[in-house]
Amino acid sequence: TSHLVKCAEKEKTFCVNGGECFMVKDLSNPSRYLCKCQPGFTGARCTENVPMKVQNQEKAEELYQK
């Protein structure tokens, strides 16, 4: 089984554009990293800009779910 832990201070720059870094702890595999991106960004390292249209759509869905 695997679980997520917040990255150590020295690993935080794995993600760009202010993305939050997490490490996937998995006993059977080497550690790997994931990014939780800030609004407006996406991609493995949060490098990609989310088009405005998509951002608005996501906000609308968020509000609907609330």
Epitope: E11, K12, F14, G43, A44
Partner: antibody, heavy 116, light 107 residues
Framework: EVQLVESGGGLVQPGGSLRLSCAAS????????IHWVRQAPGKGLEWVAA????????NYADSVKGRFTISADTSKNTAYLQMNSLRAEDTAVYYC?????????WGQGTLVTVSS | DIQMTQSPSSLSASVGDRVTITCRAS??????LAWYQQKPGKAPKLLIY???NLESGVPSRFSGSGSGTDFTLTISSLQPEDFATYYC?????????FGQGTKVEIK
Amino acid sequence: EVQLVESGGGLVQPGGSLRLSCAASGFTFSGTWIHWVRQAPGKGLEWVAAITPADGSTNYADSVKGRFTISADTSKNTAYLQMNSLRAEDTAVYYCATYMFAMDYWGQGTLVTVSS
Amino acid sequence: DIQMTQSPSSLSASVGDRVTITCRASQDVSISLAWYQQKPGKAPKLLIYGASNLESGVPSRFSGSGSGTDFTLTISSLQPEDFATYYCQQHYTLPFTFGQGTKVEIK
């Protein structure tokens, strides 16, 4: 041991094309982030392009957008920089580098000279 | 794009001196600031990343500090092999941008 070896540089005329290669070994290529950085003679460092081999996502500096294409072949552990419509100002040593938490490993560089 | 400004552009120092190089970003880059050392004809070498994290294998006389827009690289006791050019780089957002470099020369 991590190794990056660039090749493909040379002399090319303005408007010409060149493809640079960056052969990687000693690490999991598909799990990294590969960047190209260049340095004009006697000048500083300029970031050029990046690719995430795992998903193929790419990014470019405005100065090369539409002219340069970065790609990667995970089966060959090699990244490429296809350079078209070359200009005199593209003359530089081109380095590839891996990025984990910063640009931690660099190749030795390959010189591209654009001149008639 | 984020502009990176290094100072000084060059400095002369003696072996054993304490050397400080500063780097200023045109906007907040949090702690995403790296320092590289480059010797003539060679590729840059990573010294510090995340503003203050020493890269593996780099001597402890090198240290980095700062966050936001103002950063410092310090060499506590300059050694003969430290004479080189040093570059700062923001790695907060693409395009990653470098300072213009600081050349450390022998006095």
